[in-house]
């Protein structure tokens, strides 16, 4: 009975295992929602500081500065595309499983119906597994206790200047600077209108419920927790191994279904510096609190 | 080669607790999600719950006050434990993982006096 | 909770005819809707998910459609085998639901 066995050979003909894919979707959501979510929703402040750390909460103006001393021929360019494939292993990796067929491309007709799953996926609350339910519903681990409230610390007016200084390896370091500048930038808060799943507690009761089990102990991050550090650093993962974390092919195109999957990935990616280094403040030619860009695309 | 096998039902008195394992071989309890369903001639069929890869859960809000999912990834195998049993939660209780064909056979749980 | 309608509850169709089986969502479910098939005795074998795909094993006489809140099973050529009870399920929202199922019969 097809139920119960499954075969070495590619088990979805679409080219995506769906169990796999809603499960490692709920993983991430449940990640996000550890860290920013409280009584499985995510309120306002908590959308907010998910935006302000992944840093799309303001406008930035970026300068690219060329050292030429370093490089004087701007090859710092290519230095993006080197890091391809970074083969990690993570508790996350399913490979024994899924297999992976050939996709009947349901290319997504029209409206290519994009899976609330995204955004929307756990956001409200209790069903979601993968759109909530996988579905909606913000799912937190068992172990996560109450949050802290962290107050925002940059107004809307604000603007952040990105400076990218080439060192000699060829490495980019990212420095952020908080530059505060007055005048509006914004027609209103950038936070103000979060998506309708984002917002709506409501939904909660409608959807599954969810009891925490107080045996796994785990303390429960701040908005601004340190990232990467020595425990359990989270990996950076590349295209190809996003897609296969899913459970979905690397050689057939997305429809707009499957990327609703991989949303909460990586957006957690972005969120938890996965593929920035912290690079040690030894290094004279390194300012401070610099991130080395690991770009694994 | 995948595999889930419930294990645990039988008759049961209204009013007791059931407990149910279900095993599951071919795959990581660290890698899927797993799912109960049960089904009854007078209901259908009825998601009751799931049991995410680091343990968390969801419920059926109609049946959270009374049910609870656990499991031993090292056993690789899930237990469903519901309270307060009646009449009407006789059934067949599959475990699955998730909107796939893989479930197991399924264990008929009869609650009766 | 989202309540899946399907129709008709039986459906009476001789061999080798079209069959086309019909289920509601009482909200939007987008397209994660899954089509099992059950016969007596056996657990459910899941034929289409995410509304239109088809699991690997499944004859492609099998095929479903929709998306939002309405959604179609075909069976282009109803073998013997074939007769059986179909259920849609939304995973679109917890909980997750069933619908009551259509029984396909000979005709």
């Known amino acids: 009975f097809p139920q119960t066995t499954e075969k070495i050979s590619p088990n979805w003909e679409s080219g995506i295992n769906v169990d796999l894919a809603i499960s490692t979707r709920q993983y991430h959501l449940q990640q996000l929602f550890y860290r920013y979510g409280e009584n499985n929703s995510l309120s306002v402040e908590g959308f907010r500081k998910l935006l302000q750390n992944i840093g799309i909460d303001k406008i930035k103006r970026i300068h690219i500065h060329h050292d030429h001393d370093h490089h004087s021929d701007h090859e710092h360019h290519s230095d993006h595309e080197r890091h391809s494939d970074h083969e990690h292993h993570s508790e996350h990796e399913h490979h024994s499983d899924h297999d992976h067929h050939s996709h009947h491309n349901h290319a997504a007709s029209g409206k290519n119906k994009r899976k609330a799953l995204c955004p929307d996926h756990d956001s409200d609350s209790s069903g979601k597994d993968p759109r909530n339910s996988q579905g909606k519903g913000a799912h937190r681990p068992e172990h996560a206790s109450g949050r802290r409230n962290v107050k925002d610390s940059v107004s809307a007016s604000e603007v952040t200047s990105t400076v990218y200084n080439t060192v000699s390896e060829g490495t980019h370091f990212l420095e952020t600077i908080e530059t505060p500048r007055p005048g509006k930038l914004f027609p209103k808060d950038v936070s103000s209108s979060t998506p309708p799943s984002v917002t709506s507690k409501s939904r909660v009761s409608r959807l599954a419920g969810r009891k925490t089990n107080e045996s796994v102990s785990e303390p429960r991050k701040g908005f601004m927790y340190s990232r990467n550090t020595n425990e359990n650093p989270q990996e950076c993962f590349n295209a190809s191994k996003l897609l296969t974390s899913h459970g979905m092919g690397i050689q057939v195109p997305l429809n707009a279904t499957e990327f609703n999957y991989l949303c909460p990935a990586i957006i957690n990616q972005i969120d938890a510096r996965s593929c920035l280094i912290h690079t040690s403040e030894k290094k004279a030619e390194i300012p401070p609190k610099t991130y080395s860009l690991q770009i694994a695309w | 080669q995948v595999q889930l096998v419930e294990s645990g039902g039988g008759v049961v008195q209204p009013g007791r607790s059931l407990r149910l394992s279900c095993t599951v071989s071919g795959f990581s309890l660290t890698t899927y999600g797993i799912h109960w369903v049960r089904q009854s001639p007078g209901k259908g069929l009825e998601w009751l719950g799931v049991i995410w890869t680091g343990g968390t859960t969801d419920y059926n809000a109609a049946f959270i006050s009374r049910l609870t999912i656990s499991k031993d990834n090292s056993k690789s195998t899930l237990y469903f434990q519901m309270n307060s049993l009646r009449a009407e939660d006789t059934a067949v209780y599959y475990c699955?993982?998730?909107?796939?064909?893989?479930w197991g056979q399924g264990t008929l749980v009869t609650v009766s006096s | 909770e989202i309540v899946m309608t399907q129709s008709p509850a039986t459906l009476s169709v001789s061999p080798g005819e079209r069959a086309t089986l019909s289920c509601k969502a009482s909200?939007?479910?987008?397209?994660?809707v899954v089509w099992y098939q059950q016969k007596p005795g056996q657990s459910p074998r899941a034929l289409i998910y995410s509304a239109s795909y088809r699991y690997s094993g499944v004859p492609a006489r099998f095929s479903g459609s929709g998306s939002g809140t309405e959604f179609t099973l075909t069976i282009s050529s109803l073998q013997s085998e074939d007769f059986a009870v179909y259920f849609c399920?939304?995973?679109?929202?917890?909980?997750?639901?069933f619908g009551q199922g259509t029984k396909v019969e000979i005709k």
């Open positions: 399920q939304q995973y679109n929202n917890y909980p997750w639901t």
């Open positions: 909200q939007n479910v987008d397209t994660n």
């Open positions: 699955a993982r998730g909107p796939s064909s893989y």
